[in-house]
């Protein structure tokens, strides 16, 4: 399976309200034997490779906003933590995987990132994983919503796996 | 704080088996995203990596150790265990446990044990 | 399994030395490495995690670089806590390996 990201860019005005997505693409295994696990974190673009850095958001760690499931199960983040910070993760049937933030500020802006592992009793983790940008903006020059702007087909695919 | 506390037999005869528990506080076991690892190294020498347990029960072992090794979990005690068996005194060690979130390195480890293997 | 070479073995430095040790892997591992550092009957301490990035509370003295098969650890100005011994590990694919170590001694 890959991670698609439907959007590389998101730009949204202080105090809005926004949802970041992936989406797994390709066959995915819903047997006994297999777990994954979804998660979400800010980091930088590295000079090698995007993403390998794994930072909180606001002060929650990539542990702390985790789904884990099997297959094409829906999921969403432990409540209290996540939302007392503003945060809620969530998994569909249908492979989208997404991170709201509510009531954006500056600090927010970055680079965000999403994680699926494949976990399989006695196999190696498959990882991949997906990256995009927010950019929260102030002042006259801001938009009155959010203002998405989509990947190219080639930057959608464009995802590491181990 | 999470705090690894290996505990066990410190001399082990040979042909017998090893075994070892990591008595975890600070954090839950059963907690989902983490693996509980064990590594060894012994005397003088470098690390070797002897196995890992998913949250979910899931067993990764090193293939040169596989067929001696087990590792589980005890989940109202908080604890992971080691059982090596049949050790020779090439087993002779210092036995670390260790956690791991998923698609992360070790970040946390116990102290150690020594566990000498001598008749 | 994958092999993880690391040189050299052994290291003699002054403090504020900047010293560089390299970890070769036998195949690719994108930037799934570590770094750790292990003193004398203490457990190793994780440095560096994805090949470059700074575990937390780790001094900003030690940084990590390298993608596939190359890395290497760098610390730009040693200091007296640092004489100990440093080993690479692969995390791409089980079984997880380490290096065999590099010791760093005072001159």
């Known amino acids: 399976f890959k991670v698609a990201t439907p959007y590389s860019l998101y730009v949204c005005p202080e105090g809005q309200n926004v949802t970041l997505t992936c989406r797994l693409l390709g066959p995915v295994d819903k047997g006994h034997d297999v777990t994954f696990y979804k998660t979400w974190y800010r980091s930088s673009r590295g000079e090698v490779q995007t993403c390998s850095e794994r930072r909180p958001i606001r002060n929650l760690t990539f542990q702390d906003l985790h789904l884990h499931h099997g297959g094409h199960q829906a999921a969403n983040t432990s409540h209290d933590l996540a939302q007392r910070h503003g945060l809620e993760s969530a998994s569909d049937h249908h492979g989208n995987f997404s991170i709201t933030m509510r009531n954006l500020t500056l600090l927010d802006s970055g680079l965000y990132c999403c994680l699926v592992v494949e976990i399989r009793h006695h196999h190696s983790e498959h990882r991949v994983h997906g990256a995009m940008e927010l950019q929260v903006q102030t002042g006259k020059d801001a938009p009155s919503n959010c203002v998405v702007y989509p990947s190219s087909s080639q930057d959608s695919e464009n995802i590491t796996a181990a | 704080q999470l705090q690894l506390q290996e505990s066990g037999p410190g001399l082990v005869k040979p042909s017998e088996t090893l075994s070892l528990t990591c008595t975890v506080s600070g954090g839950s076991i059963s907690s989902s995203g983490y693996y509980w690892g064990w590594i060894r190294q012994p005397p003088g020498k470098g690390l070797e990596w002897i196995g890992s347990?998913?949250?979910?029960?899931?067993?990764y072992y090193n293939p040169s150790l596989k067929s001696r090794v087990t590792i589980s979990v005890d989940t109202s005690k908080n604890q992971s265990s080691l059982k090596l068996n049949s050790v020779t005194t090439a087993d002779t060690a210092v036995y670390y446990c260790?956690?791991?979130?998923?698609?992360?390195?070790?970040?946390?480890w116990g102290q150690g044990t020594l566990v000498t293997v001598s008749s | 399994d994958i092999q993880m070479t690391q040189s050299p073995s052994s290291l003699s430095a002054s403090v504020g030395d900047r010293v560089t040790i390299t970890c070769r892997a036998s195949q690719g591992i994108s930037s799934w490495l570590a770094w750790y550092q292990q003193k004398p009957e203490k457990a190793p301490k994780s440095l560096i995690y994805a090949a470059s990035s700074l575990q937390s509370g780790v001094p900003s003295r030690f940084s990590g670089s390298g993608s596939g098969t190359d890395f290497t650890l760098t610390i730009s100005s040693l200091q007296p806590e640092d004489f100990a011994t440093y080993y690479c590990q692969q995390y791409n694919s089980y079984p997880y390996t380490f290096g065999q170590g590099t010791k760093l001694e005072i001159k």
């Open positions: 260790a956690r791991h979130p998923v698609a992360m390195n070790f970040d946390d």
């Open positions: 347990l998913y949250s979910s029960g899931y067993t």
